[in-house]
């Protein structure tokens, strides 16, 4: 008998090379094989459960950056006046959540912020739980 | 043929709003659906394997905090003279281990320490390994 | 009907007690039950996907340490002039990758660096993906 295979785990890696002041970072998914989707510059959460979240990037100027998942809730990450980020977190997310950036720069100009190595990874940790597509 | 489903992953999120000096933090599990249990203020480990561990909290005063899993073993986390914690770790835990806090404040009084956002998450990383219930 | 079991997750914990200047750290796997293998002082990657990586250690002298996975690619971790490390990361690795150390000390002597609590853990996060053995 063939041993059971794992159904694919919900996970995604998005890249970002540019962030807009007072807005967010422009995210793109380099792979077509991702099991999660990007929509309106947000990562769509379909499955309830814990997620492992990795955020990396080097910014062209000092900024404050937050990663949100739901209106009215505190951010997943919040970094104040940084030029780089390399953080890992765990959070419980649920169907209908959307993961997105908010960025503020401290310069008077409203130029875009350039990003090197900008990468956001989400990996679902509770396969077998509730999902809605 | 229906694709195999994942059996539930062993995971738990406990909250704590209060820590007692020279003792630990009073942990409660907000969800009844957790696949791991709290007993005598400890999280009970039933399954051998690696665990992803996330610890967060904002404390009303400076304290030193350790997270233990087995008598005679070093702590999973150890933080000295902090007013907040936001740490992630990986550790190998085994059946019969119990994850619990130890806290010391540096004030002369023996006050309870209040906690906002106190959260401890454990997620098993090796489903398919040995478990005993 | 018996519910499907999880096939073993690809994971490994290696220990290292000694690092050689201008070379790497001598890694050994304390358990025979690991689902990943060590070969030529490297951890062999057989399965594509995200990996949770934990690196810990206390060094007998100041050193610079990098953890690589593929020729011509940047390191998974890079620490400059440290006497200890306690880091967690997430990275996408693929079949044929090999995870290995590179170490440089800043002393004129070329003595080995002694390590306490030297531990490197890799845990595959995408079971169900491509593997080749």
């Amino acid at each position: 008998q063939v041993p059971p295979q794992y159904p694919p785990i919900q996970s995604i890696r998005v890249q970002f090379t540019r962030c807009e002041n007072e807005k967010g970072c422009i995210i793109t998914s380099p792979s077509k094989d991702e099991t999660m989707k990007v929509q309106d510059n947000s990562i769509i959460i379909n499955c309830d459960g814990f997620y492992l979240i990795s955020l990396k990037g080097y910014f062209s100027e000092e900024l404050s950056l937050s990663l949100y998942y739901r209106k009215g809730r505190g951010p997943l990450f919040s970094l104040s006046k940084v030029t780089s980020v390399d953080s890992i977190g765990v959070a419980y997310l649920a169907f209908k959540d959307k993961v997105y950036f908010n960025v503020t720069t401290h310069s008077t100009s409203y130029k875009d912020i350039q990003v090197n190595g900008g990468e956001l990874i989400l990996i679902h940790q509770n396969p077998g739980g509730f999902c809605a597509y | 043929q229906v694709p195999p489903q994942y059996p539930p992953i062993q995971s738990i999120r406990v909250q704590f709003t209060r820590c007692e000096n020279e003792k630990g933090c009073i942990i409660t599990s907000p969800s009844k659906d957790e696949t791991m249990k709290v007993q005598d203020n400890s999280i009970i480990i039933n399954c051998d394997g690696f665990y992803l561990i996330s610890l967060k909290g904002y404390f009303s005063e400076e304290l030193s905090l350790s997270l233990y899993y087995r008598k005679g073993r070093g702590p999973l986390f150890s933080l000295s003279k902090v007013t907040s914690v936001d740490s992630i770790g990986v550790a190998y835990l085994a059946f019969k281990d119990k994850v619990y806090f130890n806290v010391t404040t540096h004030s002369t009084s023996y006050k309870d320490i209040q906690v906002n956002g106190g959260e401890l998450i454990l997620i098993h990383q090796n489903p398919g390994g040995f478990c005993a219930y | 009907q018996v519910p499907p079991q999880y096939p073993p997750i690809q994971s490994i914990r290696v220990q290292f007690t000694r690092c050689e200047n201008e070379k790497g750290c001598i890694i050994t796997s304390p358990s025979k039950d690991e689902t990943m293998k060590v070969q030529d002082n490297s951890i062999i990657i057989n399965c594509d996907g995200f990996y949770l990586i934990s690196l810990k250690g206390y060094f007998s002298e100041e050193l610079s340490l990098s953890l690589y996975y593929r020729k011509g690619r940047g390191p998974l971790f890079s620490l400059s002039k440290v006497t200890s490390v306690d880091s967690i990361g997430v990275a996408y690795l693929a079949f044929k990758d090999k995870v290995y150390f590179n170490v440089t000390t800043h002393s004129t002597s070329y003595k080995d660096i002694q390590v306490n609590g030297g531990e490197l853990i890799l845990i595959h996060q995408n079971p169900g993906g491509f593997c080749a053995y």
């Epitope: 505190g74 919040s78 | 709003t17 009303s60 007013t83 006050k111 209040q114 | -």
Partner: antibody, heavy 119, light 106 residues
Framework: EVQLVESGGDLVKPEGSLRLSCVVS????????MSWVRQAPGKGLQWVAY????????SYTDVVKGRFTISRDNAKTTLYLQMNTLRIEDTAVYYC????????????WGHGTSLFVSS | SYVLTQLPSKNVTLKQPAHITCGGD??????VHWYQQKLGQAPVLIIY???SRPTGIPERFSGANSGNTATLTISGALAEDEADYYC?????????FGGGTHLTVL
Amino acid sequence: EVQLVESGGDLVKPEGSLRLSCVVSGFTFSSYDMSWVRQAPGKGLQWVAYISFDGRSTSYTDVVKGRFTISRDNAKTTLYLQMNTLRIEDTAVYYCAKLSSSGWSMDYWGHGTSLFVSS
Amino acid sequence: SYVLTQLPSKNVTLKQPAHITCGGDNIGSKSVHWYQQKLGQAPVLIIYYDSSRPTGIPERFSGANSGNTATLTISGALAEDEADYYCQVWDSSASVFGGGTHLTVL
């Protein structure tokens, strides 16, 4: 000199919305937890909401949960209180307060901004 | 939720000691803070962590806390001490204020 200056108070109809702001100076805003406290006319102090220094942890008094949202912009050294579905009993002077690391006492307060909810 | 009980008002003769109490279940296990609020002004922290005085607060103000009662003492009340006094604690991620005591200096 530590200063906290609230603004945004107004006359609002029931079920309406309003956002209060508190601009701070004189201390490292991004290092301190903050709170909003209110005082209804002729009444005592009532704690409303808490936010951690990095904005990742929040808590609320029961009567405003689900209606009010506390947030902060550390870049702008500003604390906010978004108030939705306002009720007549939300009428009060709203103070922002800095929390110390000694038992979360509120060691500095603003002068307050007034909210009137009336039809 | 946790409840703090204060007497609504208290009179004290000029230059005499005043004791303002704050009752709560096992309040001695919690850190109590005291605030003074004069008419039309914002509150001011006068005692934190049961008995510590912030810089600039006169020595006549002191605090104690044990059992089910915390006490704010003004060793010799002055006319300028006429105000509302509030105790405050944290409990289960929430802050709680007492109802306040109005001190009148006669």
